[in-house]
């Protein structure tokens, strides 16, 4: 009786069961009641990630530099190749196919999460007592100067773009 | 590339045994179907039998069932022919042959053969 | 079983001329992947047999391409388009639809 369903790493054709090809192999012919599958290894600039029964290795990813890519991660016979972002750039998507420079925090806001390869700024406003001037991708929120530490007082109040200005104590005599 | 070499031919009385070897080399011996198939003097081709890459599958010629066994040993690179309670009939060049596959069913690939005389 | 026979049992050839066997089975030896299941031997002269044609027209690597296989079902024909000296010996058909495989009685083909 002809199976109807084949066991886990084979296929059903010509009503027999063939075993798939490992991955990091592609198809080259169907295995016959007296001949097994028959698979060849992938090119060095291909691969394929699954038993399977493919006839045609997937092209290794190119991480193009003009895409702001570079390898991550060289790709073999069973895996593609991992791409990432050039230092300052993140991916655009899940699938990093392009880079976008990291964004900078503005005046009143601070890093709270420095820009991955993967992933972009995450920035977070100043709370009350810091602050953050410049616009900047790697800048925290600083806290205000302390006034009293230095023997000074509050001359003007900080905001989340400023720091406090501190000035000489009146002297009362 | 694909070599065949049989051997364990000879002479023989009525009644006795033989095993044939063939020795396989040039192609993965594992992942093919082989055949022996037979030439009595001066007459047409024979096929004998069959026996699948993993040895799950195996076929005899009903001339020969029963009375012949085809067997292999992968990890030897070796086909076999256990040829049990010989006849005159049987006398022949035999010939083992590698199956071809799904692209060519049937023997693609054959030895130089060995001779093998059943008289008494 | 499925019993094969060939025509002429002999032929002789002159070199460059065509020349065509004929094979026949008492089965169909078309399967349902669309393939004829036969194959053509030749067996030269004190050497074994070699194949040249698979699937009824596939030609073997090495094969000249004066050879040519056609037909389906049940009637084959091999063919050589300029029959050289190199060609002498027998040919076979052989049916490899279903065990137990069988060959025709074979064309013994000479060189006038």
């Known amino acids: 009786e002809p199976p109807t369903a084949c066991r886990e790493k084979q296929y059903l054709i010509n009503s027999q069961c063939c075993s798939l090809c490992q991955p990091g192999q592609k198809l080259v012919s169907d295995c016959t009641e007296f001949t097994e599958t028959e698979c060849l290894p992938c090119s060095e600039s291909e691969f394929l990630d699954t038993w399977n029964r493919e006839t045609r290795c997937h092209q290794h990813k190119y991480c193009d530099p003009n895409l702001g890519l570079r390898v991550q991660q060289k790709g073999t016979s069973e895996t593609d190749t991992i791409c990432t972002c050039e230092e300052g750039l993140h991916c655009m998507s899940e699938s990093c196919e392009s880079c976008v420079p990291h964004r900078s925090c503005l005046p009143g806001f601070g890093v709270k999460q420095i820009a991955t390869g993967v992933s972009d700024t995450i920035c977070e406003p100043c709370p009350v007592g810091f602050f953050s001037n410049v616009s900047s991708a790697f800048e925290k929120c600083r806290p205000w100067t302390s006034c009293e530490t230095k023997d000074l007082v509050v001359q003007q109040a900080g905001t989340n773009k400023t720091d406090v200005v501190c000035g000489p104590q009146d002297r009362q005599r | 590339q694909v070599q065949l070499v049989e051997s364990g031919g000879g002479v023989v009385q009525p009644g006795r045994s033989l095993r044939l070897s063939c020795a396989a080399s040039?192609?993965?011996?594992?992942?093919?179907?082989m055949h022996w198939v037979r030439q009595a003097p001066g007459k047409g081709l024979e096929w004998v039998a069959v026996?699948?890459?993993?040895?799950?599958?195996?076929y005899h010629a009903d001339s020969v069932k029963g009375r012949f066994t085809i067997s292999r040993d992968n990890s030897k690179i070796t086909l076999y022919l256990q040829m049990n309670s010989l006849r005159t009939e049987d006398t022949a060049v035999y010939y083992c042959?590698?199956?071809?596959?799904?692209?060519?069913?049937?023997?693609?690939?054959w030895g130089q053969g060995t001779l093998v005389t059943v008289s008494s | 079983d499925i019993v094969m026979t060939q025509s002429p049992l002999s032929l002789t050839v002159t070199p460059g001329e065509p020349a065509s066997i004929s094979c026949r089975s008492s089965?169909?030896?078309?399967?349902?992947?669309?393939?004829?299941?036969l194959d053509w031997y030749l067996q030269k002269p004190g050497q074994s047999p070699q194949v040249l044609i698979s699937l009824g027209s596939n030609r073997a690597s090495g094969v000249p391409d004066r050879f040519s296989g056609s037909g389906s079902g049940t009637d084959f024909t091999l063919k050589i388009s300029r029959v050289e000296a190199e060609d002498v010996g027998v040919y076979y058909c052989m049916q490899a639809r279903q065990t137990p495989f069988t060959f025709g009685p074979g064309t013994k083909v000479d060189i006038r």
């Open positions: 042959a590698r199956d071809g596959g799904i692209a060519a069913p049937g023997p693609d690939y």
């Open positions: 089965q169909s030896l078309l399967y349902s992947n669309g393939y004829n299941y």
């Open positions: 026996i699948s890459y993993e040895e799950s599958n195996r």
């Open positions: 040039g192609f993965t011996f594992s992942s093919y179907g």
